[in-house]
Amino acid sequence: EPPGPEQRVVRRAAEVPGPEPSQQEQVAFGSGDTVELSCHPPGGAPTGPTVWAKDGTGLVASHRILVGPQRLQVLNASHEDAGVYSCQHRLTRRVLCHFSVRVTDAPSSGDDEDGEDVAEDTGAPYWTRPERMDKKLLAVPAANTVRFRCPAAGNPTPSISWLKNGKEFRGEHRIGGIKLRHQQWSLVMESVVPSDRGNYTCVVENKFGSIRQTYTLDVLERSPHRPILQAGLPANQTAILGSDVEFHCKVYSDAQPHIQWLKHVEVNGSKVGPDGTPYVTVLKTAGANTTDKELEVLSLHNVTFEDAGEYTCLAGNSIGFSHHSAWLVVLPAEEELMETDEAGSVYAG
């Protein structure tokens, strides 16, 4: 059921900073608030199927907990709802967003720093969309566009000015400049970069008073990391002699990855060299016309018993290497099995 009109909906959004979020977002809600956590993709990237968890345990939807693919709502929050919430990719269990949620006794309030309830007919400034101004933290992937807005009214029409980290903020303070639209009560920054992080305050004032709202901008950079391989891939395979087999390896990497498929072999009866390094033969590596997608699959046709053994997907980039391995078991064809049975021996798979 949707929250009733008397309930505040407090939104907190985090953008996916890549496969391993570097930090938890600390957020606080008031008792009785509707908590809304959202987790959005970077650079126009769909996240795929997701699940939400609290303190490591999967959340199940109920009349009070509404679970969506990129959004979680908890109605009428109480102290028991405090904890660490995470949004994870359903298949890889990769953590996409992390929130540390506190629930305080008092319902959270808007950022009206003068704290006085001034009647609208006095002409003092007031927010025209206060219910939409509670998303105080904006976490945005680098290169995207951000617009802060403080829609207001008053009589006479108030002026608006902007501060960054408490100091006057002007276009020349930023490479690429800013767009100030006084009629829209807005500040626009295109192609944000990490140096745009900070607190942005709109100050709306006329001769009868002043109100202000502070937004926090976090610009998410993907920290460089070695390739990440999807859990569970490649998977162990059992195949019949003469059949075809495919191993799959899913690679995530910001820096361009180099992917190889290796087969573990024995040399003079040993699987490892004197230094402990395994003996391998390279089955597949990047060529002039191979795409990443093609390299993520190793196809074995018409397998023989010699094909049985351990296979490794090795992915490297400028930061480092990652690898996952899987085993192939090759079973004899059914006719051979029957012949062996008649001879009285037992086959253990």
């Epitope: 959004a13 126009g44 990237a45 769909p46 951000v146």
Partner: antibody, heavy 126, light 109 residues
Framework: EVQLVQSGAEVKKPGASVKVSCKAS????????ISWVRQAPGQGLEWMGW????????NYAQKFQGRVTVTTDTSTSTAYMELRSLRSEDTAVYYC???????????????????WGQGTTVTVSS | QSVLTQPPSLSVAPGKTATFTCGGN??????VHWYRQKPGQAPVLVMY???ERPSGIPERMSGSNFGNTATLTITRVEAEDEADYYC???????????FGGGTKLTVLG
């Protein structure tokens, strides 16, 4: 200069497949998604689907589900759109476009397309 | 899924004002982007987040969005404004892009 350059015109028979490429330059490829939009002769723009250049995740319009595949190759900063089981109604200009995220403190997040390829004409005829 | 409605055509004399509308249920709760497409060319983004002009787009263009209608306005229309204009929203429920049917602007004379 930021640009998307698409592969050349194609003529295909009904039932065949077509694969259109879109090579990006002038920006960090993995920071923006790629959308595919088509336009039949004399008609409006029709969104087909999009792909994350970061992890390959995709999302397709219901109409094309199962018939279209959008992929990327980060080593060459190239996106691909393959459309299968072509019919005469698929005759159109196919565009790739860079997907940019817009984040608004009041309205939340929205995506738009700020840079477009020049278009690839695909003609399906027996 | 959002449905966006645009009138198919609009004719305006040079120097006058062209007003494009994009209708949709509670479209004012979403952010609208606008594209211009000249004959034989790819679309170009001319307005984003209802009211914001990308670099290189003249100040003659402005936008608004309220209730069930988003509007793109071009003042002092010139012959070079002749094109098709499309509105677009992002349907966050389905992660899908939705376009309006487009309006063809003809500059008279």
């Amino acid at each position: 200069e930021v640009q998307l350059v698409q592969s050349g015109a194609e003529v295909k028979k009904p039932g065949a497949s077509v694969k259109v490429s879109c090579k990006a330059s002038g920006y960090m490829f993995t920071s923006y998604g790629i959308s595919w939009v088509r336009q039949a002769p004399g008609q409006g723009l029709e969104w087909m689907g999009w792909v994350s250049t970061y992890n390959g995740d995709t999302n397709y319009a219901q109409k094309f589900q199962g018939r279209v595949t959008v992929t990327t190759d980060t080593s060459t900063s190239t996106a691909y759109m393959e459309l299968r089981s072509l019919r005469s109604e698929d005759t159109a200009v196919y565009y790739c476009a860079r997907v940019l995220g817009y984040y608004d403190s009041i309205d939340g997040y929205y995506y738009g397309m700020d840079v477009w390829g020049q278009g690839t004409t695909v003609t399906v005829s027996s | 899924q959002s449905v966006l409605t645009q009138p198919p055509s609009l004719s305006v004399a040079p120097g006058k004002t062209a007003t494009f509308t994009c209708g949709g249920n509670n479209i004012g709760d979403k952010s609208v982007h606008w594209y211009r497409q000249k004959p034989g060319q790819a679309p170009v983004l001319v307005m984003y987040l209802d009211t914001e002009r990308p670099s290189g787009i003249p100040e003659r263009m402005s936008g608004s969005n309220f209730g069930n209608t988003a509007t793109l306005t071009i003042t002092r229309v010139e012959a070079e404004d002749e094109a098709d204009y499309y509105c677009q929203v992002w349907d966050s429920g389905s992660d899908h892009v939705v376009f309006g049917g487009g309006t063809k602007l003809t500059v008279l004379g």
